[in-house]
């Protein structure tokens, strides 16, 4: 069963997925989709690479770690509560079924509603903001690109790591972040 | 307007060989996945093969593997299936469809009969 | 393989009722479920994919819902063109694979 990852609404959500390149800038095409993976490719697809470069992406959604190196984690900013749901990381490894597949699952917590400080019984609550995604249409018919000709040492999505959207966040604030779309 | 249009069917012996060609068109056939599906009298839908385009990957239902060979031509817009030692349990009606996961649109159809 | 059942076999409605169609998998496939129509002689149409989602050009009247091995194709008021066979197909699972179908039928 997919792995659950946890963030608070207005937070950005982190969700991990990691391969190692057979060697340095032999990059393997990889697409994120909202929705569990599908048989092919990616369905809904929020974010995509090539062999090179981020080759599409939507509003919200990047890659903070250093892609080249096989860290193609996702980020989803300023989550909302409809951001829940799976989402799939899809390693395309060239070569027939050899692509590796993972769920993570996205678990979206109402934000911690803080007082104001009060007098006598009057309060006031922060009610955060409920906002919808936009839908996205059939994407994962079409393809782009070729695959190239490379052999992977190790895929992993760290399970047992970075669990936590703070943790992630706490890590990626450490150090430089180049922020892709 | 998308539209794909098969052709090839016919009547074959057992252990003969029937190439199937689809015609595509209305939409930008070199950047989509391309799937065949056939359909035998009285039986459900079963997904048959695919190719992805760009790529190259192929992938085939094991009941036809080492048999059948999709294959496309995109100077031509046109998706065939290459179909080879046939028998009885190929008879269907096969279509052509656009897509990976699911599929749209279809074409008409061409019907295939196996038989001495 | 995944093993995607329909019920009923056949569904006799009359036009302007609500028809539900549901589609059942051996196993869970999550939200990767499409249904199809087809009526004689013709290609299957593309309904829904996502298990929800309208395919373009599909009137407001098909809606499909459920998630991992319950699904339901509902029809909110059938029209006289909407008797036809319909199918579910799921693709989570190598390899990819259909419902034996629904007949609709009029009453």
């Known amino acids: 069963s997919e792995v659950e990852y946890r963030a608070e609404v207005g937070q950005n959500a982190y969700l991990p997925c990691f391969y190692t390149p057979a060697a340095p800038g032999n990059l393997v095409p990889v697409c994120w989709g909202k929705g569990a993976c599908p048989v092919f490719e990616c369905g809904n697809v929020v974010l995509r690479t090539d062999e090179r470069d981020v080759n599409y992406w939507t509003s919200r959604y990047w890659l903070n770690g250093d892609f080249r190196k096989g860290d193609v984690s996702l980020t989803i900013e300023n989550v909302t509560l409809a951001d829940s749901g799976i989402y799939c990381c899809r390693i395309q490894i060239p070569g027939i079924m050899n692509d590796e597949k993972f769920n993570l699952k996205l678990v979206i917590k109402p934000a911690k509603v803080t007082p104001a400080p009060t007098r006598q019984r009057d309060f006031t609550a922060a009610f955060p903001r409920m906002l919808t995604t936009r839908g996205h249409g059939p994407a994962e018919t079409q393809t782009l690109g070729s695959l190239p000709d490379i052999n992977l040492t190790q895929i992993s999505t760290l399970a047992n790591e970075l669990r936590d959207s703070r943790l992630a966040n706490d890590l990626r604030d450490s150090g430089a972040t180049i922020r892709i779309g | 307007e998308v539209q794909l249009v098969e052709s090839g069917g016919g009547l074959v012996q057992p252990g003969g060989s029937l190439r199937l060609s689809c015609a595509a068109s209305g939409f930008t056939f070199s950047t989509y996945w391309m799937t065949w599906v056939r359909q035998a009298p009285g039986k459900r839908l079963e997904w048959v093969a695919n190719i992805k385009q760009g790529g190259g990957d192929k992938y085939y239902v094991d009941s036809v593997k080492g048999r059948f060979t999709i294959s496309t031509d995109n100077a031509k817009n046109s998706l065939y299936l290459q179909m080879n030692s046939l028998r009885a349990e190929d008879t269907a009606v096969y279509y052509c469809?656009?897509?990976?996961?699911?599929?749209?649109?279809w074409g008409q159809g061409t019907l295939v009969t196996v038989s001495s | 393989e995944i093993v995607m059942t329909q019920s009923p076999a056949t569904l006799s409605m009359s036009p302007g009722e609500r028809a539900t169609l549901s589609c059942r998998a051996s196993?869970?496939?999550?939200?990767?479920l499409a249904w199809y129509q087809q009526k004689p002689g013709q290609a299957p149409r593309l309904l829904i994919y996502g298990a929800s989602t309208r395919a373009t050009g599909i009137p407001a009247r098909f809606s499909g819902s459920g998630s991992g091995t319950e699904f339901t194709l509902t029809i909110s008021s059938l029209q006289s063109e909407d008797f036809a066979l319909y199918y579910c197909q799921q693709y989570t699972h190598w390899p990819i694979t259909f419902g034996q179908g629904t007949r609709l039928e009029i009453k």
């Open positions: 469809a656009r897509g990976s996961n699911w599929f749209d649109p």
């Open positions: 196993q869970s496939v999550y939200d990767n």
